[in-house]
């Protein structure tokens, strides 16, 4: 969490941002809140990006003002106009690109004063893994697949029964470039699995960490997966 203040004493307002990550090809949110004003027409929101000379987005007098928007953001940005009055200056970014990564500034002007805060935005690709029993294999084998990752992640297997065991010798991981030539499909195979055990396939890069669990018993197979974004901190 980053909290920024305006520069000149009583003419300053608090602006708060939260570092976040965007999944390329999908929509993302750059979070920013500020001390609200009672009059929408008195609020100006400017989003800027370090190294980009045009604006990312501008909202003033109750509507978007995009004449000075940089072309790299053309048609891809929106604020939540109905929430500006309550202090929400968050930006919706459509179709996140790898090049959207960087330092953004949320700059606010209201009748109370000015304030700004920076936000680190990371971009990459991350997806939920799915672990299945591979019945085609000669021995008991598990297959962990996740469709989209970038940058290339690490894959680690773990098991509930053999905690702390190193499965690198009995697993094989491959990365297959997807058609858009950026993201990759992750496939990891774990050999010689034993019944009545829970195995976890953990995929991680500097943006996200995802885990796919599978519990194999003689009577049933139970699966669970979850994904966590890393380094989401407020400013």
């Amino acid at each position: 969490l980053i909290i920024g203040f305006g520069i000149s004493g009583r003419h300053s307002i608090t602006v708060t941002t939260v570092a976040s990550a965007g999944n390329i090809g999908e929509d993302g949110i750059l979070s920013c809140t500020f001390e609200p004003d009672i009059k929408l027409s008195d609020i100006v929101i400017q989003w800027l990006k370090e190294g980009v000379l045009g604006l990312v987005h501008e909202f003033k007098e109750g509507k978007d003002e995009l004449s000075e928007q940089d072309e790299m953001f053309r048609g891809r940005t929106a604020v939540f106009a109905d929430q500006v009055i309550v202090g929400n200056a968050s930006l919706r970014l459509k179709n996140v690109q790898l090049t959207d990564a960087g330092t953004y500034k949320c700059y606010i002007i209201t009748s109370k004063g000015k304030g700004n805060a920076n936000l680190e935005y990371k971009t990459g690709a991350f997806s939920m893994p799915e672990v299945n029993v591979d019945y085609n294999a000669s021995s008991e084998t598990l297959r962990c697949e996740a469709p989209r990752w970038f940058p290339q992640p690490t894959v680690v297997w773990a098991s509930q029964v053999d905690q702390g065991a190193n499965f690198s010798e009995v697993s094989n991981t491959s990365f297959e470039l997807n058609s858009e030539n950026v993201t990759m499909k992750v496939v990891s195979v774990l050999y010689n699995v034993t019944i009545n055990n829970t195995y976890s396939c953990m995929i991680e890069n500097d943006i996200a960490k995802a885990t796919g669990d599978i519990k194999v018993t003689e009577s049933e197979i139970k699966r669970r997966s979850h994904l966590q974004l890393l380094n989401s901190k407020a400013s």
Epitope: G51, L53, G54, L66, S67, E68, Q69, E71, R74
Partner: antibody, heavy 116, light 106 residues
Framework: QVQLVQSGAEVKKPGASVKVSCKAS????????MYWVRQAPGQGLEWMGR????????VYAQKLQGRVTMTRDTSTSTVYMELSSLRSEDTAVYYC?????????WGQGTLVTVSS | DIQMTQSPSSLSASVGDRVTITCRAS??????VNWYQQKPGKAPKLLIY??SRLHTVPSRFSGSGSGTDFTLTISSLQPEDFATYYC?????????FGGGTKVEIK
Amino acid sequence: QVQLVQSGAEVKKPGASVKVSCKASGYTFTAQYMYWVRQAPGQGLEWMGRINPTSGNTVYAQKLQGRVTMTRDTSTSTVYMELSSLRSEDTAVYYCARGINWFDPWGQGTLVTVSS
Amino acid sequence: DIQMTQSPSSLSASVGDRVTITCRASQNIDTYVNWYQQKPGKAPKLLIYAASRLHTVPSRFSGSGSGTDFTLTISSLQPEDFATYYCQQSYTSPFTFGGGTKVEIK
């Protein structure tokens, strides 16, 4: 006031290269993009590309890709446009122009003549 | 690339006439259109940006339009207005220009 001053006219032989300079003054050099536009004799305006003076990142017109190079020197607030493998159809007045989504002001123009 | 089709390519008019120049974009470009005036041997000069916003020019100049169709209007032509006018889109690179309209004295 904001001013862009370009280097003088050049006469070049086909196959040669030319480097045109554009010196900016009266504003923060790194605050806006610098564009290059050319105009062949009696013809319209052709967008050539742009440079970000902060980062040096460039975007070039596809038809000039591989032949055009835009650079900048932040210490002298100057941008350069170099065009290689010149041909007769490159004979034109070359302009630099400052801006984000519109161009203002423009340099005075540099006439480059390509002739054997 | 976005094509900008400007018409007419030339026109003859008298001082005091109302002159209209149109520009059509090959795709929706919102209001990312600029108009420039160029006199012989001189660099182009910005007249209107963002389709309708006057730069530092007299109020007889006006611009309108959004999407694909744009217009530059000179309400009462003055002697100093005889020049060539160009539209330009700045929606996406390359920022292409129209072919130009030469306004000549009748």
